[in-house]
Interface confidence: medium
């Protein structure tokens, strides 16, 4: 097989007796993807997969990067908090069990949710064979794989390999059509000296010539260009050292009162358990590891308040204190841990030494492409495409992958909008209540009629703002009874939520300015009600005079518009959001200084903006009893997050009102909390911590319909699986492996 | 009833009318901008009451229908800007409605 | 809305004496950021409407003698005849101009000289 070249079929060439083509799952543990391109030559067989067949710069890894969680969430499409293998050590308070992979209670069904591939394959009537995989030997749903093997790490990676071919010579009837194939390297070999080593070059070697018996085993049943096959690894590696060390002793005078799940993903519950595990005082926990030393090489938080994108809270063996590493260092509760040095992985999936391998060769794989990176929460869809079979409901966006096939399976097609808009009339230019606001600006009613007309656009000027300030069409509602309506001003659209009195998303274009200072101040002390809205569907001013510790922001900034005539059209009831005080400041700066700075570099950029409501950290928008349950004696519910959705066009010489093809995105789920203590930002100005704090919340825009209930970008003239690929992207900015 | 005013320009500020029934306290009807002839009602009188302008003599006028016994009031009409107490006030007008 | 409730109803006070007036309203008139109370004082005397007193709680209207004045702040308000005069004889009303519309008024209180 090594010697040939690429073949180029265009369809399957399949022996008799292969009707449709066996799937072939292929984990190698702890293949990071800097090692494919660094040791290439070392490593013939896989080099040539690559070249051959289809490859993307990198797969992301779920968070924690650790083997267990990722290995089952590429076999159920599921994020870890929804499979319930959070981590590779837990602890149930429901089950009052604990698991780890060193005991047999590992293989209690009790601890693995979802449904995985073998599952979905043999309940559509394929047969799956497994040689390891995490979950493979545990009676999920009561059932095994049709063939498995328990786990036995002594297996030598050849005999794995023809037990594998030799269940591809079984008769037609008993054949699977799934398999799976598990090596422990380079893993091991990382853990022990490190992802830059002599023993991970020699696991590499080791791993590439049994990989090569694979394909050579292929090749000799006719099977090389009829079977799919699908090489991965479930995270990466990284270096950790002894002098780069979190010690709990160094925050807490005494540390017996917690358990602490050590190293670059460290929880921290209650000692006691069960019996203390709901009163463990957690806020107090994270409080105390806040801003503690200038150098800290962790944040802590609590789960709710991690990033959206890492999907890691709702789910009760997630422990509420929750420590975010820096690269290379490990967190432990005091100097009696000596488990450092070597390598390590589990840290933030966006770390590039956490980056895994995703190769692909076979009839229903494009040739001799790379892709652009994406999550392995993506190809339990995929693998039942190539299998011609229906996903059980999982996490993945099916048909985001499409583009790595020849020919599609499953075309996706944009969603139906579920709750029909309105468009919010105007009526009478004088507001027929006041909601308790004021505008000491308009000192009479023929100014206040004036700017108040402002607000009664004719078609055409409706027309113009939608081209501009909506270029890739509304966002549809598909959460089921909101009550909605659309309201059209000169330099932005919004659509207003009635129930919670509050603009659902706001849309508007930034152009490239030819100055980047920042913008001028909002006119001081002025708002007023909007009269398209009626009183009994509007915020009330005075609701941002009794608490000091909420205040009235604009979804809209008014600043951004360059005349303070037009600032009005924004200075309006249905344009406030409420915020805490110490949010606004991160909010304000980010619009008068970074959105200008965005919109520069990428010759202007479409702005959607809207709030969140996650109050169960479910990572899906809240039923409406679920925010009713946390108005505290208020008509206005307070957002747990806001969303910030940056468009602009790939190709820089375009506007985003007019780009022809692809778009470029940076989305923006920010935690809405009443302190910025998670940047530290004591005596630091705001352009040293806010620009990083967003940064560190960036999210997919699948991410944020999730928790709005919105779809984006439907009017944009391009296929929906590709479309599906720009929802699905995930922005990064790390540089060093 | 009307409204004539002097001594300012009429479509500067806003009219308001407000009555009074015989030993009661003060009730606001309704606010006209005599600028554009637009009109807010007080939820009570809506659908019965009209309030008009004529710019060209300077006076407002305040319609109510289907009068009842209890409509027996003095109505006065004054003056403001937008969110400012009335400063000046007519002299009032005696309604008294008999069966 | 916004329900005014003035206290007490009327009011009997020798002349050259001080006459004190309570405003009472149901939520808050003062509009914070601007450190102002939306709340005004008239006079009202037989067969004549209503004069403004005191605007913005403690705002003297211009004419208006000194011996009138205004205080309180956010639900409850005070106007203060210092020494009371014949003249000064009339229903007064506070009203607020914070939640509009609509614009509201206290009952009155009737000031008559003992």
């Known amino acids: 097989w090594l010697e040939e070249n690429c073949d180029t079929a265009q369809q399957s060439q399949c022996p008799e007796g292969f009707d449709l083509p066996p799937v072939i799952l292929f984990s190698m543990d702890g293949f990071r993807a800097e090692y494919l391109y660094t040791w290439d030559t070392l490593m013939p067989n896989i080099n040539k997969l690559k070249t051959c067949g289809i490859h993307s710069k990198y797969m992301r890894a779920m968070y924690p990067t650790k083997t267990f969680p990722n290995h089952y969430t590429i076999v159920t499409g599921l994020y870890p908090e929804s499979h319930g293998i959070i981590d590779n050590n837990m602890y149930d308070v429901n089950l009052n069990k604990n698991f780890s992979l060193s005991s047999k209670e590992q293989n209690n069904p009790a601890w693995w949710h979802g449904q995985p591939m073998w599952l979905t394959a043999m309940y559509q009537g394929l047969k799956a064979a497994t040689y390891f995989w995490p979950g493979s030997e545990v009676a999920i749903n009561g059932s095994f794989p049709s063939i498995y093997m328990p786990y036995n790490g002594s297996v030598p990676f050849e005999e794995r390999i023809s037990t594998l071919l030799k269940w591809l010579d079984l008769p037609k009837a008993e054949r699977p059509r799934f398999y799976t194939m598990y090596f422990e390297e380079p893993d091991s070999s990382g853990h022990a000296g490190g992802p830059v080593s002599a023993r991970v070059i020699k696991a590499l070697q080791v791993v590439d010539h049994a990989f090569g018996m694979l394909m050579e085993g292929l090749k000799q049943r006719n099977l090389h260009n009829c079977v799919n096959i699908i090489l991965l690894a479930d995270h990466g590696m990284d270096q950790t050292y002894c002098n780069k060390m979190e010690y709990m002793t160094d925050y807490f005078p005494r540390i017996n009162f917690f358990y602490m799940y050590e190293g670059p993903a460290p929880r921290i519950r209650a000692h006691n358990i069960p019996h203390d595990f709901f009163s463990f005082n957690s806020e107090e926990i994270v409080r105390n590891l806040s801003c503690r030393k200038p150098d800290q090489h962790f944040k802590p938080y609590l789960t709710p308040d991690l990033p959206k994108r890492l999907h890691y809270a709702k789910n009760v063996r997630i422990d509420k204190v929750h420590l975010f590493v820096d690269q290379q260092w490990l967190a432990v509760r005091s100097k009696s841990n000596t488990n450092c040095g070597g390598g390590n992985h589990g840290y933030n999936n966006e770390f590039r030494s956490m980056e895994a391998i995703f190769l692909a060769h076979g009839p229903s794989f494009k040739e001799k492409t790379e892709v652009e990176p994406f999550e392995n929460i993506e190809v339990y869809n995929l693998m039942c495409d190539l299998l011609r079979i229906q996903p059980a409901p999982n996490n993945g966006t099916h048909g985001s992958l499409n583009h790595l096939l020849k020919v599609p399976f499953y075309e996706p097609s944009h969603a139906e909008e579920v709750s029909k808009f309105s468009v919010c009339g105007f009526a009478n230019p004088l507001p027929t209540e006041s909601l308790d606001c004021f505008c000491p600006h308009l000192q009479n009613s023929t100014q206040l009629e004036q700017v108040n007309q402002m607000l009664n656009l004719t078609q055409e000027e409706i027309t113009a703002t939608v081209k501009v300030n909506l270029p890739f069409g509304r966002p549809r509602v598909l959460q089921k009874n909101v009550d909605h309506c659309l309201l059209y001003h000169r330099e932005y659209v919004s659509g207003f939520g009635k129930a919670m009195r509050m603009p659902m998303w706001s849309s508007y274009t930034v152009p490239q300015l030819g100055d980047t200072s920042p913008l001028p101040p909002t006119v001081p002390d002025c708002l007023r009600a909007d009269v398209r809205v009626p009183p009994s569907e509007s915020q009330k001013c005075s609701f941002y005079l009794a608490d000091k510790n909420i205040t009235h922001g604009f979804l809209y900034p008014p600043a951004s518009n360059r005349t303070s005539d037009s600032q009005y059209d924004a200075l309006i009831t249905s344009n406030l959001v409420p915020m805490y005080e110490e949010f606004r400041k991160m909010w304000d700066y980010f619009h008068s200084v970074l959105l200008i700075k965005h919109a520069t570099e990428r010759n202007g950029v479409n702005v959607v903006s809207g709030p969140i409501f996650d109050y169960n950290y479910d990572g899906h928008f809240d039923a409406p009893d679920e925010i009713t349950k946390h108005l505290a004696n208020t008509d206005v519910p307070i957002p747990t997050h806001y969303f910030v959705v940056l468009t602009s066009c790939k190709n820089k010489s375009h506007t985003p009102e007019n780009c022809p093809g692809w778009l470029d995105v940076l989305p923006f789920i920010i935690p809405h909390r009443p302190t910025n203590v998670e940047s530290c930002p004591e005596g630091k100005p705001e352009a040293l911590w806010v620009e990083e704090r967003f940064t560190a919340h960036i999210a997919r825009v699948r991410d944020v319909e999730l928790l709005t209930g919105l779809d984006f970008y439907q009017d944009k003239v391009q296929p929906v699986s590709e479309i599906l690929q720009l929802k699905t992207y995930l922005p990064t900015f790390e540089t060093t492996i | 009833v009307s409204c004539k005013a002097s001594g300012y320009t009429f479509t500067s500020y806003d009219i308001h009318w407000v009555r009074q029934a015989t030993g009661q306290g003060l009730e606001w009807m309704g606010w006209m901008n005599p600028n554009s002839g637009n009109t807010v009602y007080a939820q009570k009188f809506q659908g019965r009451v009209t309030m008009t302008r004529n710019t060209s003599i300077s006076t407002a006028y305040m319609e109510l229908s289907s009068l009842r016994s209890e409509d027996t009031a003095v109505y006065y009409c004054?003056?403001?800007?937008?969110?400012?107490?009335?400063?000046?006030w007519g002299q009032g007008t005696l309604v008294t409605v008999s069966s | 809305d916004i329900v005014m409730t003035q206290s007490p109803d009327s009011l009997a006070v020798s002349l050259g004496e001080r006459a004190t007036i309570n405003c009472k309203s149901s939520q808050s008139v003062l509009y914070s950021s601007k450190n102002k109370n939306y709340l005004a004082w008239y006079q009202q005397k037989p067969g004549q409407p209503p004069k403004l007193l005191i605007y913005w709680a403690s705002t003297r209207e211009s004419g208006v003698p000194d011996r009138f004045s205004g205080s309180g702040s956010g639900t409850d308000f005070t106007l203060t005849i210092s020494s009371l005069q014949a003249e000064d004889v009339a229903v007064y009303y506070c009203q607020q101009y914070y939640s509009t519309p609509p614009w509201t008024f206290g009952q009155g209180t009737k000031v008559e000289i003992k």
């Open positions: 004054a003056r403001t800007v937008l969110l400012w107490p009335f400063d000046y």
